[in-house]
């Protein structure tokens, strides 16, 4: 379901990643150097930036982030 409109709810931050608000609605997500072998599963649709560097992700399927704009 869609998140209710609110100024007090935190946008989704994947486990172990570091998140930082980007303006009024968006979220910058840093998942670098976490030893990930696949994409985080619970990325927010409000993600404006995603850092997956220094992980072990060897391949991406076509359209790997369908929820992102």
């Amino acid at each position: 379901g869609s998140s209710p409109r609110s100024g007090v709810l935190l946008r989704g931050c994947p486990t172990h990643c570091h998140c930082e608000p980007d303006g009024r609605m968006l979220l910058r997500v840093d998942c670098s150097d976490l030893g990930l072998s696949e994409l985080p599963s619970n990325l927010s649709v409000f993600t404006s930036y995603l850092d997956l560097s220094m992980n072990n992700i060897s391949q991406l399927l076509p359209n790997p982030l369908p929820s992102l704009r």
Partner: antibody
Framework: QVQLVQSGSELKKPGASVKVSCKAS????????MQWVRQAPGQGLEWIGE????????NYNQGFTGRFVLSVDTSVSTAYLQISSLKAEDTAVYYC??????????WGQGTTVTVSS | DIQMTQSPSSLSASVGDRVTITCRAS??????LNWYQQKPGKAVKLLIS???RLHSGVPSRFSGSGSGTDYTLTISSLQPEDFATYYC?????????FGGGTKLEIK
Amino acid sequence: QVQLVQSGSELKKPGASVKVSCKASGYTFTNYWMQWVRQAPGQGLEWIGEIDPSDSYTNYNQGFTGRFVLSVDTSVSTAYLQISSLKAEDTAVYYCARSLSGYVDYWGQGTTVTVSS
Amino acid sequence: DIQMTQSPSSLSASVGDRVTITCRASQDISNRLNWYQQKPGKAVKLLISYRSRLHSGVPSRFSGSGSGTDYTLTISSLQPEDFATYYCQQGNSLPPTFGGGTKLEIK
């Protein structure tokens, strides 16, 4: 710098109403939500509700619907909390606080409301 | 509503001590956790958002961690100005709810 200046302490009788104000400065008032939180004597923090000053959209905690009304006057960058039909258990410190992407980064100094006959 | 259980409710410690405060949610809150500091007669201050993001101006001796339902605030070396009451708050669902607070006192 960001400042949220709240109105002074209030002493009210049961059944009366009170309107607490929160004057914002140092930022664009309509770019941030305003949260309201209360703290009863010796107790923790309890969320009352929030208002988006850009269009006055509100969310309330279920326990604070009806007697508690949030509003804003963007012309003077001020948010208001009005409480009607005051009860003794409404005695508390009431805080306004601004929020953006989910966290409350600046708080007012608090307004003490005492309800006593 | 999501219940936030904070422990301990009070804690005595000395300057230089390492202190850990725990916050447990009644359900998974997906890292959506903030920590605040309150001192008597002063405005409440944001310390940490998104479980581990240090707010600007907050000393690096403060850190946050955890996942799922369990989160911690750690102060690596207590300073005199750190004696205060600390609250966790979940931002996962409405209404946002706070822990009961941890009062940190000088031993």
